[in-house]
């Protein structure tokens, strides 16, 4: 996150970090004890994914951390990286054992399709992650967060030569300086409703980060809530 | 205690104190010996009964006030004069999370998993120890809403 602030421990308890063999590479959100939602482009064939919940400072081990292996990764069925790496950029990760919910490890709320859309249109959301804090710069060690305004579709379409499909939305600042960035992918865009946060987007892509006249592009969660709920049902 | 006799007595005093000449709130209170009843009387005495014209629609109940009135609407209606169908599309039916219409076409509020409807039937309160989307760490000073 570029231009964000340090989160306090437990401020975004639904946020998780995805870790590969060597380094962290993406974010995600807790759906329930056994499932995490992330971006489909975060899943690399043949790479073992470890999910870290309750993470705050990546540079030191913390008692709040819970590490889990991913035993099943399910990108949305229309996702096809060879055609478009960022279209339908959403995936579910099944964990090898349930997370223990507490003040630092809590699921994000997911409303139905209509309400997720309504919440998105409130106009402001919060994004968070341990991604780069400067364009092409270093990654954050302490979880960062940023309040981002929704950008109307027409403005967003004018800002880029790339396709912005109906299952994507844009958020950010025309003047630049504040945006999600590499390493934040898969993390949450949430909208707060009367003190309760609902998932409204998945951090997906952008041209550079925090550039003037450019915006962050997010997967529109409303399009996928039925699929998320159906796949992540706890029996 | 004969309440009929009492009412007659109050009416007589009221005629004398407030109808034959202008009385103050304090004088009216001496007649009623009860603030609530005095206030009711006073609202109409000062500027007439705004409820006289039956402004409340759809079976709403009118309460007179000084220079104004208030409609208490029947379930399913809202607005100043109860002229609007209570609907989820207007202010989300006053629900804090979700709103839907039940079989009688009444607005019913509901909550996401892990929450239940509070006593006011509009707000949602946690129903599990760690409900979704809630920050439960007590020392967090930064509010998300700036």
């Amino acid at each position: 996150v570029v231009g964000g602030e340090d989160a306090e421990r437990g401020q975004f308890p639904w946020q998780v970090l995805l870790h590969g063999e060597i380094a962290a590479f993406c974010g995600g959100s807790i759906v329930n004890e056994k499932w995490v939602v992330t971006a489909a482009h975060c899943i690399k064939p043949g790479v073992k994914i470890t999910v870290v919940a309750g993470e705050h400072n990546t540079e030191k081990p913390e008692p709040t951390e819970q590490k889990r292996n991913v035993i099943r990764a399910i990108p949305y069925h229309s996702y096809n990286a060879s055609i478009n790496k960022y279209s339908h950029d959403i995936a579910l990760l099944e964990l090898d054992e349930p997370l223990e919910l507490n003040s630092y490890v809590t699921p994000i709320c997911i409303a139905d399709r209509d309400y997720t859309n309504i919440f998105l249109k409130f106009g402001y959301g919060y994004v968070s992650g341990w991604g780069k804090v400067f364009n092409r710069g270093r990654s954050a060690s302490i979880l960062q967060y940023l309040k981002v305004p929704l950008v109307d579709r027409a403005t967003c379409l004018r800002s880029t030569k790339f396709s912005i499909y109906s299952h994507m939305f844009c958020a950010g600042y025309h003047e630049g300086g504040k945006d999600s960035c590499q390493g934040d992918s898969g993390g949450p865009h949430v909208t707060e409703v009367e003190g309760t946060s609902f998932l409204t987007g998945i951090i997906s892509w952008g041209e550079e980060c925090a550039m003037k006249g450019k915006y962050g592009i997010y997967t529109k969660v409303s399009r996928y809530v039925n699929w998320i709920k159906e796949k992540t049902k706890l029996t | 205690y004969n309440s009929g006799k009492l009412e007659e007595f109050v009416r007589g005093n009221l005629e004398r104190e407030c109808k034959e000449e202008k009385c103050s709130f304090e004088e009216a209170r001496e007649v009623f010996e009860n603030t609530e009843k005095t206030t009711e009387f006073w609202k109409q005495y000062v500027d007439g009964d705004q409820c006289e014209s039956n402004p409340c629609l759809n079976g709403g109940m009118c309460k007179d006030d000084i220079n104004s009135y208030e409609c208490w609407c029947q379930a399913g209606f809202e607005g100043t004069n109860c002229e609007l169908d209570a609907t989820c599309s207007i202010k989300n039916g006053r629900c804090k999370q979700f709103c839907k219409r039940d079989t009688d076409n009444k607005v019913v509020c509901s909550c996401t998993d892990g929450y239940r409807l509070a006593e006011d039937q509009k707000s949602c309160e946690p129903a599990v120890p760690f409900p979704c989307g809630r920050v439960s760490v007590s020392h967090i000073s930064k509010k998300l809403t700036r």
Epitope: K48, T50, N69, I71, H77, E94, D96, T235 | -
Partner: antibody, heavy 125, light 106 residues
Framework: QVQMQQSGAELVKPGASVKLSCKAS????????INWVRQRPEQGLEWIGW????????KYNEKLKGKATLTTDKSSSTAFMQLSRLTSEDSAVYFC??????????????????WGQGTSVTVSS | QIVLTQSPAIMSASLGEEITLTCSAS?????MLWYQQKSGTSPKLLIY???NLASGVPSRFSGTGSGTFYSLTISSVEAEDAADYYC?????????FGGGTKLEIK
């Protein structure tokens, strides 16, 4: 191609310890878990645990915790399992197996796809 | 732990016959794996997510199921199919295997 080569048969006395090895080749050793599974004579398969060579993290079957200790040597792409305080109940064939993501229909599923040939451990005085 | 119960324990089949082996789980699992183990060898992955065949597995093998009930079908048994068959779950710790079904060819 992927291969898992296990060490030879062992005959050990009760109360002793033994260290079995499993050399992996044909893939990036640090990127996938190594599982250990045992099979007692005329019995089914029992999962012992896994180790992730990338960071050394482990997960054990609680029932066998303290019995088995899993380690790896990245330089030789070898996984080890030390069995301690052996009893006749521990006589079995011990297998190592790589677990990897299998892709199907765009999704990825974990499975133990390549197995070693097994090491027979006999505990007898 | 999740207990997997396989039935029958032993099955005898004629060449060309269609057979079905079943695996019942004590709790719901998200998917099932099946392994084949021939005498004196290590187990071989047969089916890796309830119904998908591992590389090199003949198409006469198929799997189905969900929740607590899964099955493995061999549409036309061949002599080389004589082996022990194990179902295996990854959904919760400890990972567990069924007790196995021994397939004998008449």
């Amino acid at each position: 191609q992927v291969q898992m080569q296990q060490s030879g048969a062992e005959l050990v006395k009760p109360g002793a310890s033994v260290k079995l090895s499993c050399k992996a080749s044909g893939y990036t050793f640090t990127s996938q878990d190594i599982n250990w599974v045992r099979q007692r004579p005329e019995q089914g398969l029992e999962w012992i645990g896994w180790i992730f060579p990338g960071d050394g993290s482990t997960k054990y079957n609680e029932k066998l915790k303290g019995k088995a200790t899993l380690t790896t040597d990245k330089s030789s792409s070898t996984a080890f399992m030390q069995l301690s305080r052996l009893t006749s109940e521990d006589s079995a064939v011990y297998f190592c197996a790589r677990s990897a993501y299998y892709r199907y229909d765009g999704s990825y599923y974990y499975a133990m796809d390549y197995w070693g040939q097994g090491t027979s451990v006999t505990v007898s005085s | 732990q999740i207990v997997l119960t396989q039935s029958p324990a032993i099955m005898s089949a004629s060449l060309g016959e269609e057979i079905t082996l079943t695996c019942s789980a004590s709790s719901s699992v998200s998917y099932m794996l099946w392994y084949q183990q021939k005498s004196g060898t290590s187990p071989k992955l047969l089916i890796y997510t309830t119904s998908n065949l591992a590389s090199g597995v003949p198409s006469r093998f198929s799997g189905t199921g969900s929740g607590t009930f899964y099955s493995l079908t061999i549409s036309s048994v061949e002599a080389e199919d004589a082996a022990d068959y194990y179902c295996h779950q990854w959904s919760s710790y400890p990972r567990t295997f069924g007790g196995g079904t021994k397939l004998e060819i008449k």
